[in-house]
């Protein structure tokens, strides 16, 4: 088999026939050095998954439940291409499973026990697996058989396809539980009708069901969605209030050596030639000898799944939780109203050691999880491997785009009411050596630059955003002669000045000596022409305040700030000479952990915060000898956000817009992945 062949897995005679037709038609339109198709027939989707894992086949299209199976060890497959529905301009690759209720009914998600429920059908995704999976640990024990537990949880249900003899309560609202449209309450529209008719109190359907059944907005306004955080939202706010976001139909491949680029090349060319309304001879999204063969008949095309996206991220935390609960049937011992330990995400060894010290001192309230980069940490929080971390504003933006929420803000100024008063922010500045007297904001081209890290506020987003507005391109590595911007591509000139050894060179963590505020300033001291840092960095590392050999003899007077008007000012005049105001660093978490992270961190800062006077004899949460480990070292307290509890509100319109403008220059693979899930 030539190297450019994609072996497609078919699960029936009809699929195999369509696959052969696909193969032959692709041969006729693609040059001989292009991708080609070979067909492999297996008895089931699970057999296809195993065949791909064993390198006997390369690709198959699966629905969400099977994507989960494909991801599990030992299969370890990943999503590579998604089918989309709707239009090319507004492609839909996901649907949302929602819980719909009548507006005046007054109960929340955590009050569903004893209510009457309407389901699309037993074992179906939006109508059963997702809601029951998410409610699983609230079901009365024993939870097996599942149908009995569900029947005892709700006061009555319509769950088409259930066994009405063994579980009559599941058929109470639709006598007979018929498994077809003969049952008026079957399927999406049926489950909604069950709610509309007043038979049930809640319907588990997908987001489009309400719009398909109620064309009139005034009618839709009689209904609301139940959100997982025990609030309600209007039915058109399903993106912010759903049980799970579910991919419709996805091509999977091996995680390693999976030919994902080749599969995309093949499918992209296939949709060009044989997609919707392209060819009479062969149609990719049509199944004359059956239904949904190889691909869904309703699909309009394909989109490449970003490479950073693994199956867990693609399926989303809620969906994975629901399916795992159903499959594994395990629930925590602890009562659900008690907070479990918060799993803090620590970057590299230095942070992990401090985190472990915190964990020991916290007496079981804090646990630690390690990752190599901030983006890896954010991904771990998204999928539940970790719960929280404190982030620079640039990463609060990425975390927010990935569905995380800010929960507390670092405050840097001493005040009587620190915890109740989140600050306006700190200043992003450009520092130069006083001796380089000809250097100004207007002649930085060709100079050597020092950055905290790519994607961070003071070190990257603000200065590079301003620079982008001037030069109108993203080739910052050509603008500066060389520099250190940890997180840049290793062969970039913006890694040339970095000091990390071996694989640690230019890594965006403390293994790179020029990482972070202190690192960027050190880079200026030792090699660079300009450092992009925060206004406190110079005073914190001069006048003997940093005992490290490189810093101990430094004098603040030897450094100056570059102002945007082309002038320079002394370091202490940052208020009149800065690049922009930056939002303070903030702790982020998943929505479901928000309350517990808030509660535990407030307890922890009362024990180990700034009120601890002797850090040599006690653990201090906000100290790490100028290394900013876990939190910035100048943190005075973690402050409540009040109503600034989304990333947009926290960061502010101006900063969100600035980072949005820089998006075209973004190298963040995580941001790309998250905007795929939520454009």
């Amino acid at each position: 088999v030539p190297d450019k062949t994609v072996r497609w897995c078919a699960v029936s005679e009809h699929e195999a026939t369509k696959c052969q037709s696909f193969r032959d038609h692709m041969k006729s339109v693609i040059p001989s050095d292009g991708p080609s198709v070979a067909c492999v027939k297996k008895a089931s989707y699970l057999d296809c998954i195993r065949a791909i894992a064993a390198n006997e086949a390369d690709a198959v299209t699966l629905d969400a439940g099977l994507v989960y199976d494909a991801y599990l060890a030992p299969n370890n497959l990943k999503p590579v291409v998604a089918e989309f529905y709707g239009s090319k301009e507004d492609p839909q690759t996901f649907y949302y499973a929602v819980a719909v209720v009548k507006k005046d009914s007054g109960f929340q998600m955590n009050q569903l026990r004893g209510k009457k429920s309407c389901h699309t059908g037993l074992g179906r995704s939006a109508g059963w697996n997702i809601p029951i999976g998410l409610l699983y640990c609230d079901l009365p024990e024993p939870r097996k058989p599942l149908e009995k537990a569900v029947a005892n949880f709700f006061s009555g249900s319509c769950a088409p396809c259930a066994d009405g003899t063994d579980f009559p309560q599941l058929c109470q609202l639709c006598p007979g539980c018929g498994c077809s449209t003969l049952n008026q309450y079957f399927g999406y529209s049926g489950a909604f009708k069950c709610l509309k008719d007043g038979a049930g109190d809640v319907a588990f359907v997908k987001h489009s069901t309400i719009f398909e059944n109620l064309a009139n907005k005034a009618d839709r306004d009689q209904y609301e969605l139940l959100c997982l955080d025990n609030t309600r939202k209007p039915v058109d706010e399903y993106k912010d209030c759903h049980l799970a976001q579910v991919p419709s139909h996805t091509v999977v491949a091996r995680s390693m050596g999976g030919k994902e680029d080749l599969i995309w090349e093949l499918l992209n060319q296939a949709q060009e030639h044989f997609g919707k309304d392209k060819s009479k001879e062969f149609q990719l999204f049509s199944s004359p000898h059956g239904k949904d063969l190889l691909f869904k008949d309703s699909a309009h095309g394909f989109l490449k799944v970003p490479p950073r996206m693994d199956a867990k991220m693609y399926l989303g935390y809620e969906y994975v939780t629901a399916i795992r609960n159903l499959r594994e049937g395990t629930c925590p011992e602890a009562p659900t109203d008690e907070c479990k330990p918060v799993k803090w995400c620590a970057l590299s060894h230095h942070e992990r050691l401090k985190c472990d010290e915190w964990s020991v001192n916290s007496v079981g309230k804090i646990e630690c999880v390690s990752a190599e980069t901030t983006e890896d940490c954010i991904a771990k929080i998204m999928n539940g491997e970790a719960d929280a971390m404190s982030l620079d504003g640039g990463f609060v933006y990425i975390a927010g785009k990935c569905g995380l929420v800010p929960v507390l803000a670092e405050n840097y100024n001493k005040s009587d009411n620190c915890e109740d008063t989140p600050e306006a922010g700190y200043f992003a500045i450009a520092v130069v050596k006083k001796s380089a007297s000809d250097l100004t904001w207007d002649n930085l081209k060709g100079k050597k630059s020092c950055h905290t890290a790519v994607g961070r506020t003071a070190g990257w987003n603000i200065p590079m955003g301003l620079l982008y507005n001037k030069i109108n391109h993203c080739r910052f590595d050509e603008f500066f002669s060389e520099g250190c911007a940890p997180g840049s591509k290793k062969d970039s000139s913006l890694c040339k000045l970095c000091m990390g050894s071996g694989l640690n060179l230019c890594e965006p963590n403390n293994k790179e000596g020029y990482y972070g505020y202190t690192g960027a300033f050190r880079c200026l001291v030792e090699k660079g022409d300009v450092a992009f840092v925060k206004h406190q960095t110079v005073p914190q590392n001069t006048g003997g305040k940093n005992p490290d050999p490189w810093a101990k003899n430094l004098n603040e007077k030897d450094y100056e700030l570059l102002c945007l008007d082309g002038t320079r000012k002394p370091v202490e005049e940052y208020a009149n000479c800065h690049l922009a105001r930056a939002p303070n660093h903030a702790v982020v978490t998943r929505k479901d952990k928000e309350a517990c992270v808030h509660k535990i961190l407030r307890q922890q800062q009362h024990l180990f915060g700034s009120n601890v006077t002797d850090c040599s004899g006690n653990f201090c949460l906000f100290r790490s000898e100028t290394k900013d480990l876990l939190f910035r070292d100048d943190t005075v307290c973690l402050a409540k956000l009040h109503d600034r509890n989304t990333y947009e509100k926290y960061l502010g319109e101006e900063y969100v817009k600035a980072v949005g403008n820089l998006r075209k220059c973004s190298t963040s693979s995580l941001l790309e992945a998250c905007t795929f899930r939520r454009p």
Partner: nanobody, 112 residues
């Protein structure tokens, strides 16, 4: 009230070994983990190694591969085995567990 007592320190040549022990009087010792710190003359106290109740261990970068922390709950003791000692390891070594004040420490001097 739990009290901690460190012992095992002394004068040793570079490359040599020492085994420090931390013994607790009283019950509930180390339920949440035990940390060894050290303080060199004129320097801040720094974490050397820690061991949690589940046996998880971690070390500061400069001692990794040379020092080993271990525990024996039956004996209410935590040890720090120090091999390939370097002059930079000189200092007073303390063990600590949450809620219990620092003990006297045990001095370690590594001569070159």
């Amino acid at each position: 009230q739990v009290k901690l007592e460190e012992s095992g320190g002394g004068l040793v040549q570079a490359g040599g070994s020492l085994r420090l022990s931390c013994v607790a009087s009283g019950s509930g010792f180390g339920i949440n983990g035990v940390i060894w710190y050290r303080q060199a003359p004129g320097k801040q106290r720094e974490l050397v190694a820690l061991i949690k109740s589940d046996g998880y261990t971690n070390y500061r970068e400069s001692v990794k591969g040379r020092f080993t922390i271990s525990r024996d709950d039956a004996k209410n003791t935590v040890w720090l085995q120090m091999n390939a000692l370097e002059p930079e390891d000189t200092g007073v070594y303390y063990c600590k567990t949450p809620g219990v004040p620092f003990g006297q420490g045990t001095p370690v001097t590594v001569s070159s």
